[in-house]
């Protein structure tokens, strides 16, 4: 799997999108997990609603939310109040039974300032010899969520 870099700004919210084939993954719940070390397990952070038909409902675990557009085939994860220690390698997963298919590998990068990232033209895309193959960098520098957009109280 290729790895996509999503760059966010400390203190703000970051939206990560994971596109998938809606027919292939029809009826499957999704999850967002954090990789523990290079070869370690992927620790579940949050998963979509237990009832697949309600996957569009946003579910929260702490400052992380997940919602699934099952028709359009896009899983969206929101990391609220992003902090440097949130940086790391994550995965979007499609669940079936006790198994999980990786939809996308995501490297979350937390920048100190929205002006600190390079322009897309300056970004380096590593070749196949590098550990992250055919990397794609998403400048998901986004504003903080407005108060009214945050479900209160957050449900997990």
């Amino acid at each position: 799997h290729n790895t996509t870099v999503f760059q966010g700004v400390a203190g703000q919210s970051l939206q990560v999108s994971c596109p998938y084939d809606s027919m292939k993954h029809w009826g499957r719940r999704k999850a967002w997990c954090r990789q523990l070390g290079e070869k370690g397990p992927c620790q579940r952070v949050v998963s979509t609603h237990n009832l697949w038909l309600l996957s569009f409902l946003r579910r929260w675990n702490g400052s992380t939310a997940i919602t699934d557009d099952t028709l359009g085939g896009t899983l969206t994860i929101t990391l609220r109040n992003l902090q440097p220690h949130d940086a790391g390698l994550y995965q979007c997963q499609s669940l079936h039974g006790s198994e999980a298919d990786t939809l996308r590998k995501v490297l979350v990068e937390v920048l100190a300032d929205p002006l600190d990232h390079r322009d897309a033209g300056d970004l380096w895309f590593p070749g196949e010899s590098e550990s992250f193959e055919d990397a794609h960098v998403e400048h998901s520098i986004s504003r903080s969520l407005l108060e009214g957009e945050i479900p209160f109280p957050p449900t997990s």
Epitope: V5, Q7, A10, G11, Q35, G37, Q83, P84, H85, D86, A87, G88, L89, L107, E109, V110, L111, A112, D116, H117, R118, D122, L123, W124, P126, E130, S131, F132, A135, V137
Partner: antibody, heavy 120, light 107 residues
């Protein structure tokens, strides 16, 4: 064995600029952030900034923004820091340090330091 | 900026003793705290990260604890080679900041 080999000591005049290097070996350069830390004589440590050689992402300590510029050359696994408009306050030892992409980790390897003396 | 305060600039101990070095953050930093050891004339070395995880190769007499705002580095069975300055650092939020350091003196 992980090694961060830094360039030698420099003596510069006030107002001048200096560019120091940090050559990494013993690991995959693009898999780790490179940080720079300042240690003034007999004092504590100050984080200057970090650069991700993989994505090009850079974060600076606001205190050093406009004063320090971080770059990398992936082909030679070398990180650089340029300091401009130097004053006596910039006299210090500067360390490059490696940090895992995972935000739960700290700066696990340090270079031997580059001593900068600003004097007329 | 988060201020990391190491209240003791110097601490004196004897070989074989147990010593605790403390560090206080000006606001909650969760467990995003590291401890470094710097021996005279050398670069700092990582001892502990994520408040309590020992870095590879660090002797188990070094133990880190704490979360939120109060953190402790404990050295049990102090050895003469532990003569050094110890710094705490938070990496919970930008800019990353260090404590002022605690110099450990061996009696």
């Amino acid at each position: 064995e992980v090694q961060l080999q830094q360039s030698g000591p420099v003596l510069v005049k006030p107002g001048a600029s200096v560019k120091m290097s940090c050559k990494a070996s013993g690991y995959k350069f693009t898999d780790y952030y490179m940080n720079w830390v300042k240690q003034s004589h007999g004092k504590s440590l100050e984080w200057i900034g970090t650069i991700n050689p993989y994505s090009g992402g850079i974060s600076y300590n606001q205190k050093f923004k406009g004063k320090a510029t971080l770059t990398v050359d992936k082909s030679s696994s070398t990180a650089y820091m340029e300091l401009n408009s130097l004053t006596s306050e910039a006299s210090a030892v500067y360390y490059c340090t490696r940090r895992n992409w995972d935000g739960r980790y700290a700066m696990d390897y340090w270079g031997q330091g580059t001593s900068v003396t600003v004097s007329s | 900026d988060i201020v990391m305060t190491q209240s003791h600039k110097f601490m004196s101990t004897s070989v074989g003793d147990r010593v605790s070095i403390t560090c206080k953050a000006s606001q909650d930093v969760s467990t995003a705290v590291a401890w470094y050891q710097q021996k005279p004339g050398q670069s700092p070395k990582l001892l502990i990260y994520w408040a309590s995880t020992r870095h590879t190769g660090v002797p188990d007499r070094f133990t880190g604890s704490g979360s939120g705002t109060d953190f402790t580095l404990t050295i049990s069975n102090v050895q003469s080679e532990d003569l050094a300055e110890y710094f705490c650092q938070q990496y919970s939020s930008y800019p990353f900041t260090f404590g002022g350091g605690t110099k450990l003196e061996i009696k």
